[in-house]
């Protein structure tokens, strides 16, 4: 039975700045030749029929839900893209993470401007800080990593703060073993 396709993002962020580029790829089942792909944005069928959907110079209207479909196979699970205009944007590799999976956070400056004295906060408390911009890279996420994150930093010698982002780490489902 063909599996549901999966939408992936490159770069992997589902929160991007206005004017940035992102490519959505519909990763399908390898067992059949893909002739065309259907893309849905906020429920509406897109004109794009390739397995990759390129968003160039993102606009606010590009925000929303994206799904893809290969031939008559089920639609993919939705991916949500949000387009921002701000000085700082906290980006995460995923907002819902399975326990044991990696989690990557970065504090991204508008127009890729340098951000320094970057501080990450989790649930209102300073978590990680450094003189220049830096990332948080958790190899194996745990439930304790769930929380509300935001970052602060200086751009052109002025202090800014990102919008908060909720990260949820969920327990991996325990496999069931049946006695033969």
């Amino acid at each position: 039975v063909p599996q549901k396709p999966k939408v992936s993002l490159n770069p992997p962020w589902n929160r991007i700045f206005k004017g940035e580029n992102v490519t959505l790829t519909c990763n399908g089942n390898n067992f059949f030749e893909v002739s065309s792909t259907k893309w849905f944005h906020n429920g509406s069928l897109s004109e794009e029929t390739n397995s990759s959907l390129n968003i160039v110079n993102a606009k606010f209207e590009d925000s929303g839900e994206y799904k893809c479909q290969h031939q008559q196979v089920n639609e993919s699970e939705p991916v949500y893209l949000e387009v921002f205009s701000d000085w700082l944007l906290l980006q995460a590799s995923a907002e819902v993470v399975m326990e044991g999976q990696p989690l990557f956070l970065r504090c991204h400056g508008w127009r890729n401007w340098d951000v320094y004295k970057v501080i990450y906060y989790k649930d209102g408390e300073a978590l990680k800080y450094w003189y220049e911009n830096h990332n948080i890279s958790i190899t194996n996420a745990t439930v304790e990593d769930s929380g509300t994150y935001y970052c602060t930093g200086k751009v052109w010698q002025l202090d800014y703060e990102s919008e908060p982002l909720n990260i949820t780490v969920i327990k991996a489902p325990r496999e069931k073993y049946w006695l033969q």
Epitope: Y116, K117, I119, A126, L127, K128, Y129, W130, Y131, E132, H134, N135, I136, S137, I138, T139, K154, Q157
Partner: antibody
Framework: EVQLVQSGAEVKKPGESLKISCEGS????????IAWVRQKPGKGLEWMGI????????KYGPSFGGQVTISADKSINTAYLEWSSLKASDTAMYYC??????????????WGLGTLVTVSS | QSVLTQPSSVSGAPGQRVTISCTGS?????????VHWYQLVSGAAPKLLIY???NRPSGVPDRFSGSKSGTSASLVIAGLQAEDEADYYC???????????FGGGTKLTVL
Amino acid sequence: EVQLVQSGAEVKKPGESLKISCEGSGYRFSSYWIAWVRQKPGKGLEWMGIIYPYDSDTKYGPSFGGQVTISADKSINTAYLEWSSLKASDTAMYYCARLALIRGSIIFDYWGLGTLVTVSS
Amino acid sequence: QSVLTQPSSVSGAPGQRVTISCTGSSSNIGADYDVHWYQLVSGAAPKLLIYGYTNRPSGVPDRFSGSKSGTSASLVIAGLQAEDEADYYCQSYDSSLSEVVFGGGTKLTVL
């Protein structure tokens, strides 16, 4: 009470390996950077590098990258400084220090007593 | 040669006031990176004296104060006492080197 307890003095020969330690207590170890600072005999302080135990992010001073390895084991609240092949010029006092954020300033607020490393043939 | 320049030694009689300077550049002190001061007494752990140019941690006597002007910072010790005899280091961050930097240290002698 915050404490950084360093391992004892070491006397080694050139070419030998060494790993010294710094154990933190009295605070949430994984949420603060731990730095290593060198003081050669009669000289000033030099920043060697730093590790954030929460995600093992490590940064090295330009003079020390490739010369030493900084690591940490957050399960036992301990940071390490390691040499694979010591030189006589590594003879120095090595301090570990906690990097904290206080009122927007990033500072070394607590220090260990230092580990004296002597490398001599 | 340290990135932050301090006088190698200063001295003063008990009760006097001494100033230790720390001169940097546009990529450290002049680039809005704070300056902190540490005291090293032989055989003891280094101690934070002043942070963010002017702030004193609890337990540090108010005889110690700090200031900043342009690309320089200063530590002032008023009413010198015998126990102030120590080495003093300023510290900041240098964006062009991407590293934490210390001054060369100043030996304070109480006459």
